[in-house]
């Protein structure tokens, strides 16, 4: 349940819409019910109720990151910020948007070929895979020094969705984030009650597969606000 | 390369503590979770603690709860485990790791609990 | 929590043979979220398999993983002489994290 690994997992850290009073967390326990996934493991999430507050960049929309909005500003409230396009300045990956990558402090491309003579490490944690580069999913060509990755399986660490192989997406996994399957036809989702606020999900799901909408299940329309099921449905 | 190098294990008596530090190089510490896992005497390996990229989330084993606490400072590279009110049963050598599953390992550290 | 149960607990066999370990969870993974490491004495463990069935960074080609719900598999289609080692599975799939027990693959 929600409560069970909410108070046996310290979540420190986090905005008071998420977190509670500071210095109290996981106070925000009753907000949202836990709820099974279709396949059977446990999920859970707490909904934001205020504009962005977050605490890990996951937590915000694929165009941004989580960061103080001040430079230098208080670490404990942080905020959706937007992504930093290509030649803008960084500190990690998730600062850049989509496509590119965080190297040397500058978002970069990370469609341009890259070389051999590059350090592999900051090549292929670009992906989110770096663990798999050799017998894995990474394959050279001796005639060139362009390096060529296949990306993420299901289970695979990644960085975002843009890591995973298709039909799969990037999403929270305990301390980490790994490639889980994108959503089914009558699949549980999440629906999110702001757009870009994610919310705290330890298990957290995919969005819902081309031409599907995470919508109320028809069902449980009586239901009370916070015990509705959602489900991925044709638009 | 990937490197994980702990240290701060050695001998505490029952009830005593210690502070565990695991020095990372070699990749973007902060983009990845981290765990330590340790391993008694000729016995197989536990999970004892997680914690994620930016260090706002962490998890912790049902054995270890309430005794351990996991903190990584980004900008040092460093990953820490703080384990207080120390058993004997905690005998064993830790280990830090990259990730959920283990990718890259330190060499461990081993951390006797006697009196 | 989910055990994890691997059988046999120990494997008598000679370089050059398939080695084929099992690996039983209490319950079904609904997800491949399942590793498998090498340890050898004295040594941290190695990242073999990720995923159920991807291979991780070095690990050469005789080594595959295979399953899903409750049985899983790893395979070393031709055993070399530093593949005897002890060899864990582990679930990444709920919580808590846990470990099989191992298998140590010894020389006959």
């Known amino acids: 349940t929600l409560n069970s690994v909410l108070n046996s997992n310290a979540i420190k850290n986090l905005p008071p819409p998420l977190g509670g009073a500071a210095g109290h967390p996981g106070s925000a326990v009753s907000a949202a019910p836990g709820i099974l996934y279709p396949g059977g493991n446990k999920y859970q999430t707490i909904d934001n109720y205020q504009p962005y507050p977050c605490a890990e960049d996951e937590e915000c929309g694929t165009d941004e990151y989580c960061a103080s909005p001040t430079r230098g500003g208080d670490a404990g409230v942080q905020i959706c910020l937007a992504c930093r396009k290509r030649r803008k300045r960084c500190m990690r990956h998730a600062m850049c948007c989509p496509g590119n990558y965080c190297k040397n402090g500058i978002c970069v491309s990370s469609d341009q070929n890259h070389f051999r003579g590059e350090i592999e490490e900051t090549i292929t944690e670009s992906f989110g895979n770096d663990h798999s580069t050799l017998d894995g999913y990474s394959r050279r060509t001796t005639l060139s020094s362009k390096m060529y990755h296949t990306k993420g399986q299901e289970g695979s660490v990644c960085l975002r969705s843009s890591d995973c192989a298709s039909g799969l997406c990037c999403a929270r996994h305990f301390w980490s984030k790994i490639c889980k399957p994108v959503l089914k036809e009558g699949q549980v989702c999440t629906k999110h009650r702001r757009k870009g606020s994610h919310g705290l999900e330890i298990f957290q799901r995919c969005y819902c597969g081309e031409g599907l909408s995470c919508r109320i299940q028809k069902d449980h329309h009586q239901a009370s606000n916070s015990s509705r099921l959602h489900t991925c449905q044709r638009h | 390369q990937v490197q994980l190098v702990e240290s701060g294990g050695g001998l505490v008596q029952p009830g005593g503590s210690l502070r565990l530090s695991c020095a990372a190089s070699?990749?973007?510490?902060?983009?990845?979770?981290m765990t330590w896992v340790r391993q008694a005497p000729g016995k197989g390996l536990e999970w004892v603690s997680g914690?994620?990229?930016?260090?706002?989330?962490?998890y912790y084993a049902d054995s270890v709860k309430g005794r351990f606490t996991i903190s990584r400072d980004n900008s040092k590279n460093t990953l820490y485990l703080q384990m207080n009110s120390l058993r004997a049963e905690d005998t064993a050598v830790y280990y830090c790791?990259?990730?959920?599953?283990?990718?890259?390992w330190g060499q461990g550290t081993l951390v006797t609990v006697s009196s | 929590d989910i055990v994890l149960t691997q059988s046999p607990a120990t494997l008598s066999l000679s370089p050059g043979e398939r080695a084929t370990l099992s690996c039983r969870a209490s319950q079904n993974l609904f997800s491949p979220y399942l590793a498998w490491y090498q340890q050898k004495p004295g040594q941290a463990p190695r990242l073999l398999i990720y995923?159920?069935?991807n291979r991780a960074t070095g690990v050469p080609a005789r080594f595959s993983g295979s399953g899903s719900g409750t049985d899983f598999t790893l395979t070393i289609s031709s055993l070399e002489p530093e593949d005897f080692a002890t060899y864990y599975c582990q679930q990444y799939g709920d919580e808590p994290i846990t470990f099989g027990q191992g298998t140590k693959v010894e020389i006959k």
């Open positions: 790791a990259r990730t959920i599953y283990m990718d890259y």
């Open positions: 995923g159920a069935s």
């Open positions: 070699g990749f973007t510490f902060n983009n990845y979770g």
């Open positions: 914690i994620s990229g930016s260090g706002s989330y962490t």
